[in-house]
């Protein structure tokens, strides 16, 4: 809980508490906004982002967005609140410990996005289907 000597503030989202009043630590994420990238046709890539930031709000998770068009490839790394859409998409995988890229429909470009909730998890972005636990073959391997 916030101890008695720490003020409680009204309507503040910098702090998240559970029903017992415990305080949530914020996420640590790669946060370089949009950078040009050489990541292409690989199973996974490192972000090459040297900035690990403390997310402003404890409910925020790590996000990575990979975009390719006729001119360039970019990789965006940020913190974002999973209750809010990002680039008009819901962060459906926000509880995942790994950043597993999912393709999204965007006209005129190839667009992949992932979100995750372990420290610096958007540093390693994964495109390979073998990491996707919705894959029944992978589940078979895991439980063998």
């Amino acid at each position: 809980t916030i101890p008695p000597h720490v003020q409680k503030s009204v309507n503040n989202d910098m702090i998240v508490t559970d029903n017992n009043g415990a305080v949530k630590f914020p996420q640590l994420c790669k946060f370089c906004d949009v950078r040009f990238s050489t990541c292409d046709n690989q199973k996974s890539c490192m972000s090459n982002c040297s900035i690990t930031s403390i997310c402003e709000k404890p409910q925020e998770v790590c996000v990575a967005v990979w975009r390719k068009n006729d001119e360039n490839i970019t990789l965006e790394t940020v913190c974002h609140d999973p209750k809010l859409p990002y680039h008009d998409f819901i962060l459906e995988d926000a509880a995942s410990p790994k950043c597993i890229m999912k393709e999204k429909k965007k006209p005129g470009e190839t667009f992949f996005m992932c979100s995750c909730s372990s420290d610096e998890c958007n540093d390693n972005i994964i495109f390979s289907e073998e990491y996707n636990t919705s894959n029944p073959d992978l589940l078979l391997v895991i439980f063998q």
Epitope: T1, P3, P4, H5, D18, N20, A22, V23, F25, L28
Partner: nanobody, 124 residues
């Protein structure tokens, strides 16, 4: 008994510097990620900076990146925050807090995770 005791706060002019200290006792300092957290008057907690127990990897909020430097001296069980280029919006009570590896939540205890805080006022 776990204790975290902050010091070094005070009144400073905009553009000035301060160095905060947090003396830790009653737990194995080298097992914990340590944080500086601040609370401006009437506002909520803002997580300012963190440092790993070993290897001294550091993390900062974007609002203080490039101006503040966190460090620790494990031999003295002490955490530091060097604050440069201070601004009026840095005015707050500064607390140190501790985090076990993998810990997502702070349990509800006044003394286990928080110090009493030290007030930093940036004003001309």
């Amino acid at each position: 008994e776990v204790q975290l005791l902050e010091s070094g706060g005070g009144l400073v002019q905009p553009g000035g510097s301060l160095r905060l200290s947090c003396a830790a006792s009653g737990f194995t300092f080298t097992e914990y990620r340590m944080w500086w957290v601040r609370q401006a008057p009437g506002k909520g907690l803002e997580w300012v900076s963190a440092i790993e127990p070993i290897g001294n990897r550091t993390y900062y909020a974007r609002s203080v990146f490039g101006r503040f430097t966190i460090s620790r001296d494990n031999s003295k069980n002490t955490l530091y925050l060097q604050m440069n280029s201070l601004r009026a919006e840095d005015t707050a009570v500064y607390y140190c807090a501790k985090q076990m590896p993998g810990q997502k939540w702070m349990a509800k205890s006044r003394f286990d995770y928080w110090g009493q805080g030290t007030l930093v006022t940036v004003s001309s």
